[in-house]
């Protein structure tokens, strides 16, 4: 069938202290998030079809002012990458919250069946779980 | 026919003082904006085909420096949502101009025929009407 | 054939002093960048198929803190436009790095065979060449 794999996820929770990963959830019962092709494995998104994908993300910090992001010596950073299989581990997209409270970006990237994408939020600030402020998605665009 | 509904709009004007909505316009005579499927109803974008859409927006403040956004005024916020029918009213995408003068983001979301999207700019500041600084678009990506 | 033209590029280098253009490169040997349809002409992206395209970009400044971007009187600005043929020259997308170190955006725009896209970075700050921080791409979405 035509590879129209697509997913849009909402934030479920952050990981324990030593785990920078964000944990995602999706499905109509949760609101406007969905998985049609890709799947979730312990809150991480796994690709099921080879191809070029548009990956997009927006993350908003929960309790945030421009001073809260600028005051921190180690800026809060969001990185989206392939975290498994280990042989394909790579950072795909990286942004820092300098004096802002939201990052948003998108990129085209080749992904393969079995690639698991991780979204790592480094720093001490917590992300908002509001579904219009923090979301993560992929869209298959061509083989 | 294959649902390739797509639109890219440019800012026409802001609403009167108590109306936070931005009013959009589109069409080849105006430049590089267009509507192919969706339609405008009093400056608001109405969807004519069910499906999952990629919604994207960029808004730049007209007179802005980092001092004006951080020092001078209460946070200006942009929210994209379904504003009618009332039964489907929801915020899809929300961003604040903390220390910046531009917000830009995108997301995948299911939309239905008849959904009207509103872009609400709260705060006192005026958005730029330059077509390369402020624009709003949707693209049907799958059923 | 179905017009699935698509490209994702990584930064090769900046231009000489009087040339604000960024010079791009792409291909599997370089990492996750690729050109499938569009082509590069001296580091600038040339379109080979008419249609509506989703254009996206992210640029991160190499040595950057919020003070380095806010200190400059003339803010660093990124503009994506058609630079040739001259008869079609236009700015498509423009963003300033006010108190931030990264800009990212996307838009839908009609492009024609032979259009060459330029990405002009004005100001004195240098862009990062990290492939997860700075990238530029286009995706054909419909005729």
């Amino acid at each position: 069938s035509l590879g129209w794999d697509i997913a849009e996820l909402q934030l479920n929770h952050t990981g324990p202290q030593q785990d920078p990963r964000l944990y995602w959830q999706g499905g109509p019962a949760l609101g406007r998030s969905f998985l049609r092709g890709p799947e979730l494995d312990k809150g991480q998104l796994r690709i099921r079809r080879d191809g070029i994908y548009m990956v997009h993300i927006q993350v908003t910090l929960a309790i945030c002012s421009s001073t809260s992001t600028s005051r921190h010596h180690h800026p809060t950073t969001l990185a989206v990458g392939i975290c498994s299989p280990a042989s394909r581990s790579i950072s795909l997209l990286r942004l820092s919250f300098h004096q802002g409270c939201t990052i948003a970006s998108q990129r085209l990237t080749p992904l393969a069946r079995g690639d698991t994408l991780c979204t790592n939020l480094t720093g001490t600030l917590l992300p908002s779980r509001n579904t219009d402020e923090t979301f993560f998605g992929v869209q298959w665009v061509r083989p | 026919s294959l649902g390739w509904d797509i639109a890219e709009l440019q800012l026409n004007h802001t609403g009167p003082q108590q109306d936070p909505r931005l009013y959009w316009q589109g069409g080849p005579a105006l430049g590089r904006s267009f509507l192919r499927g969706p339609e405008l109803d009093k400056g608001q974008l109405r969807i004519r085909r069910d499906g999952i859409y990629m919604v994207h927006i960029q808004v730049t403040l007209a007179i802005c420096s980092s001092t004006s956004t951080s020092r001078h005024h209460h946070p200006t916020t942009l929210a994209v949502g379904i504003c009618s029918p009332a039964s489907r009213s929801i915020s899809l995408l929300r961003l604040s101009f903390h220390q910046g003068c531009t917000i830009a983001s995108q997301r995948l979301t299911p939309l239905a025929r008849g959904d009207t999207l509103c872009t609400n700019l709260t705060g006192t500041l005026l958005p730029s009407r330059n077509t390369d600084e402020t624009f709003f678009g949707v693209q049907w990506v799958r059923p | 054939s179905l017009g699935w033209d698509i490209a994702e590029l990584q930064l090769n280098h900046t231009g000489p002093q009087q040339d604000p253009r960024l010079y791009w490169q792409g291909g599997p040997a370089l990492g996750r960048s690729f050109l499938r349809g569009p082509e590069l002409d001296k580091g600038q992206l040339r379109i080979r198929r008419d249609g509506i395209y989703m254009v996206h970009i992210q640029v991160t400044l190499a040595i950057c803190s919020s003070t380095s971007t806010s200190r400059h009187h003339h803010p660093t600005t990124l503009a994506v436009g058609i630079c040739s043929p001259a008869s079609r020259s236009i700015s498509l997308l423009r963003l300033s790095f006010h108190q931030g170190c990264t800009i990212a955006s996307q838009r839908l725009t009609p492009l024609a065979r032979g259009d060459t896209l330029c990405t002009n970075l004005t100001g004195t700050l240098l862009p990062s060449r990290n492939t997860d921080e700075t990238f530029f791409g286009v995706q054909w979405v419909r005729p």
């Epitope: 002012s65 001073t67 | 802001t14 003082q17 007209a62 007179i63 802005c64 420096s65 001092t67 004006s68 020092r71 001078h72 005024h73 209460h74 006192t124 500041l125 005026l126 730029s128 009407r129 330059n130 | -």
Partner: antibody
Framework: QLQVVESGGGLMQPGGSLRLSCAAS????????MSWVRQAPGKGLEWVSS????????YYADSVKSRFTISTDNAKNTLYLQMNSLKPDDTAVYYC????????????WGQGTQVTVSS | QAVLTQPPSLSASPGSSVRLTCTLN?????????ISWYQQKAGSPPRYLLY?????????GSGVPSRFSGSTDASANAGLLLISGLQPEDEADYYC?????????FGGGTKLTVLG
């Protein structure tokens, strides 16, 4: 340093026309907020009109709408106020006010130019 | 349309503190407008003093002494200009202005007299 200097005031008959000018210096004129504010003799300040960023927006007080036109010449860094169908109530000192990085404030003021409308 | 009301006059002694009020009509919330303050001395053009929205969102005009500060009183739907350590040169007319989306409106002004 933001500086603005008004000119063009004078004595006019009711129904007449007049064009005020405001020469600006010390800031990027085209991306700024420029306004006219007037003060009738012995009265308070009244906002008249504003023009924003590359002439993208123009706004007018109800009392002058359709009679006054605000405009700029970015090449000359000059703001104008074309006043038509003048009334005695328009008699005032007209101030030019500017803000280079925030539209909501009148940061820099000129000395004003006197407009008198009388028969 | 916003309407701003200021007391026409106020007098106080040198060294004292005064509070000038700028009340917005009930149809509009002070939180929806940017309130700024201007000083005008006899025979001179107005001078920008300050803008205030909150403690973290305010702006002092160039060369304006820190004796001048802003505040808001949400319950009274009013902007406030506070002047401490009043000095004879503070005698002037004080105007507030409210801004939203292109349009400005001024209050009627308060004439501040410094006694003695």
């Amino acid at each position: 340093q933001l500086q603005v200097v008004e000119s063009g005031g004078g004595l006019m008959q009711p129904g007449g026309s007049l064009r005020l000018s405001c020469a600006a210096s010390g800031f990027t004129f085209s991306g700024s907020a420029m306004s006219w504010v007037r003060q009738a003799p012995g009265k308070g300040l009244e906002w008249v009109s504003s023009i924003y960023s590359h002439s993208m927006y123009t706004y007018y007080a109800d009392s002058v709408k359709s009679r006054f036109t605000i405009s700029t010449d970015n090449a000359k860094n000059t703001l104008y106020l074309q006043m038509n169908s003048l009334k005695p109530d328009d008699t005032a000192v007209y101030y030019c006010a500017a803000s280079s990085d925030y539209e909501g404030l009148f940061v820099s003021w000129g000395q004003g130019t006197q407009v008198t409308v009388s028969s | 349309q916003a309407v701003l009301t200021q007391p026409p006059s106020l007098s106080a002694s040198p060294g004292s503190s005064v509070r000038l009020t700028c009340t917005l009509n009930s149809a509009n919330s002070v939180g929806s407008y940017d309130i700024s303050w201007y000083q005008q001395k006899a025979g001179s053009p107005p001078r920008y003093l300050l803008y205030y929205y909150s403690d973290s969102l305010s702006h002092q005009g160039s060369g304006v002494p820190s004796r001048f500060s802003g505040s808001t009183d949400a319950s009274a739907n009013a902007g406030l200009l506070l002047i401490s350590g009043l000095q004879p040169e503070d005698e002037a007319d004080y105007y507030c202005s409210a801004y939203n989306r292109g349009s400005h409106v001024f209050g009627g002004g308060t004439k501040l007299t410094v006694l003695g």
